[in-house]
């Protein structure tokens, strides 16, 4: 009788991560008696994937009923494939022996390739806020994709950015890959409503590229401009002085009035008005009793914005 052959008809198969992979194997004879085992890889370091006789292989099922007397189909199905399952799988026939079975013949092997989608890109910005005209860095990361080829683009409000550096790791062969990119963005006063977008395209994506976003509202600090003005006299001996705090972001702001360097009143900004560009305006007023002063009064509006050093604007009130 012709010697047993182990036939693995598929030289290579490709499977999407999360799906099942069927590895086909048939033998041409029932002789010699002995089990079939599946391995990933060859040589002494090979990994046992399935043993017909013993062991627990929760992700592996046989395609045929191996208990049937004349069964010659030893194909297996591996469920929930991940990139880590990639490799060459060998169907190996053993001859019954004592105490151990002896390897008799191996199939030619089936290379399993796994395609995996990139994870949703995560964009992160600087730890501390920065002011307009400063350059800040944003990073974008996506993981777990295969094959290695991937494209990454950066956008600010729909306009493609060019100042970025991207790395795909590892450089050599791997079961899956990660991408890391850093983009530099110059902030402007109008960026409170702006968005930075990282877009990743890969062969496995049936839809549009995956996008990760960062709102510049979490990165930018727009310092206020101050204007102190004296209003017309409201009543005899009383002057109304206002401090206009304009175009600031974020909202956190504390204002202190000083009369000739002495603290008159401190208040925290509330009932702000929002500008179209996302910045805020606020106005504080101080009623000064002129009759309490014999000399001219120096009024100072001092603003501490978002924990930054105070800025101030003064106004000299003439007492005549």
């Amino acid at each position: 009788e012709e010697e047993l052959q182990v036939i693995q008809p598929d030289k290579s198969i490709s499977v999407a991560a999360g799906e099942s992979a069927t590895l086909h194997c048939t033998v041409t004879s029932l002789i010699p008696v002995g089990p079939i085992q599946w391995f990933r890889g060859a040589g002494p370091g090979r990994e046992l994937i399935y043993n017909q006789k013993e062991g627990h292989f929760p992700r592996v099922t046989t395609v045929s009923d191996l208990t049937k007397r004349n069964n010659m189909d030893f194909s297996i199905r591996i469920s929930n494939i991940t990139p880590a399952d990639a490799g060459t799988y060998y169907c190996v026939k053993f001859r019954k022996g004592s105490p151990d079975h002896v390897e008799f013949k191996s199939g030619a092997g089936t290379e399993l390739s796994v395609r995996a989608k990139p994870s949703a890109p995560v964009v992160s910005g600087p730890a501390a806020r920065a002011t307009p005209q400063h350059t800040v860095s944003f990073t974008c990361e996506s993981h777990g994709f295969s094959p290695r080829d991937i494209t990454l683009k950066w956008f600010k409000n729909g306009n493609e950015l060019s100042d970025f550096q991207t790395n795909v790791d590892p450089a050599g062969d791997s079961v899956s890959y990660s991408i890391h990119s850093t983009a530099k963005v110059v902030l402007t006063r109008e960026d409170v409503h702006s968005q930075v977008i990282c877009e990743v395209a890969h062969v496995t994506l049936q839809g549009d590229p995956l996008r990760g976003t960062a709102n510049l509202s979490e990165t930018i600090r727009v310092p206020p401009t101050l204007e102190v003005t004296q209003q017309p006299v409201r009543a005899e001996n009383q002057v109304n002085v206002t401090c206009q705090v304009r175009k600031f972001y974020p909202q956190r702001l504390q204002l202190t009035w000083l009369e000739n360097g002495n603290v008159s009143r401190t208040e925290t900004a509330s009932t702000l008005t929002e500008n179209k560009d996302g910045t805020y305006n606020w106005m504080s007023w101080l009623l000064v009793n002129v009759s309490a002063h014999r000399d001219d009064v120096k009024l100072t509006c001092q603003v501490e914005h978002d924990g930054q050093p105070a800025v101030s604007k003064s106004h000299d009130l003439k007492v005549s």
Partner: antibody, heavy 116, light 109 residues
């Protein structure tokens, strides 16, 4: 799983024409779909694709002449102004489940003839 | 745009012959290459994807190889039903566009 093109006919130069691709056995919201054409006795030519979310992408030569759109069960190819060189069999196809680099299911095609 | 050059444009062969068709890309497309078979008046049929993976239901006499710019479709033993036109098709992962070769017509000798 099946694709069937329709709408092919004799059209006059300068007139618009819309072709449809009706799908069954799968959801258009899960796959990229493509349009291709083949002039008589010539090779296959890529026109464009539409992503699972409905964004169209076109071959560089299309230059706004064609528009791809879709509903839940059909994908359309609108030809804005027919030219004689648009005479061809038009095919729709679906990309494979593993990725967008190949097309594993094709419709039988619909013939468009442009002549005055 | 990437150009795909297929050769030969036609060939004559007999049943049982080994047939090889090549496809060359004008720039690297890694392994993003598919092969299709088309018969007159019919739609193309996918044979090979990712340069070397046999599509389900396709006979094992068809095989593909290559990566980068040079690719090969081999029919190990030509059968009567294999007389048809064969096309290669590339996908470029940066431009995300597709290009076909001009086709190879396999005729009966």
């Amino acid at each position: 799983v099946q694709l069937v093109e329709s709408g092919g006919r004799l059209g006059q130069p300068g007139t618009p024409l819309t072709l449809s691709c009706t799908v069954s056995g799968f959801s258009l919201s899960s796959y990229v779909m493509g349009w291709f054409r083949q002039a008589p006795g010539k090779g296959l030519e890529y026109i464009g694709i539409i992503s699972s979310s409905g964004s169209p992408y076109y071959a560089s030569w299309v230059n706004g002449r064609f528009t791809i759109s879709k509903t839940s069960t059909t994908m359309d190819l609108k030809m804005n102004s027919l030219r004689s060189e648009d005479t061809a069999t038009y095919f729709c196809a679906r990309v494979g489940p593993l990725g967008v680099d190949y097309f594993n299911i094709w419709g039988p095609g619909t013939l468009v003839t442009v002549s005055s | 745009d990437i150009q795909m050059t297929q050769s030969p444009s036609s060939l004559s062969a007999s049943v049982g012959d080994r047939v090889t068709i090549t496809c060359r890309a004008s720039q690297s497309i890694n392994s993003y290459l598919a092969w299709y078979q088309q018969k007159p008046g019919k739609a193309p049929k996918l044979l090979i994807y990712s340069a070397s993976f046999l599509y389900s239901g396709v006979p094992s006499r068809f095989s593909g190889s290559g990566s980068g710019t040079d690719f090969t479709l081999t029919i190990s033993s030509l059968q009567p039903e294999d007389f048809a036109t064969y096309y290669c098709q590339s996908w470029h992962y940066i431009s995300r566009s597709y290009t076909f070769g001009q086709g190879t017509k396999v005729e009966i000798k």
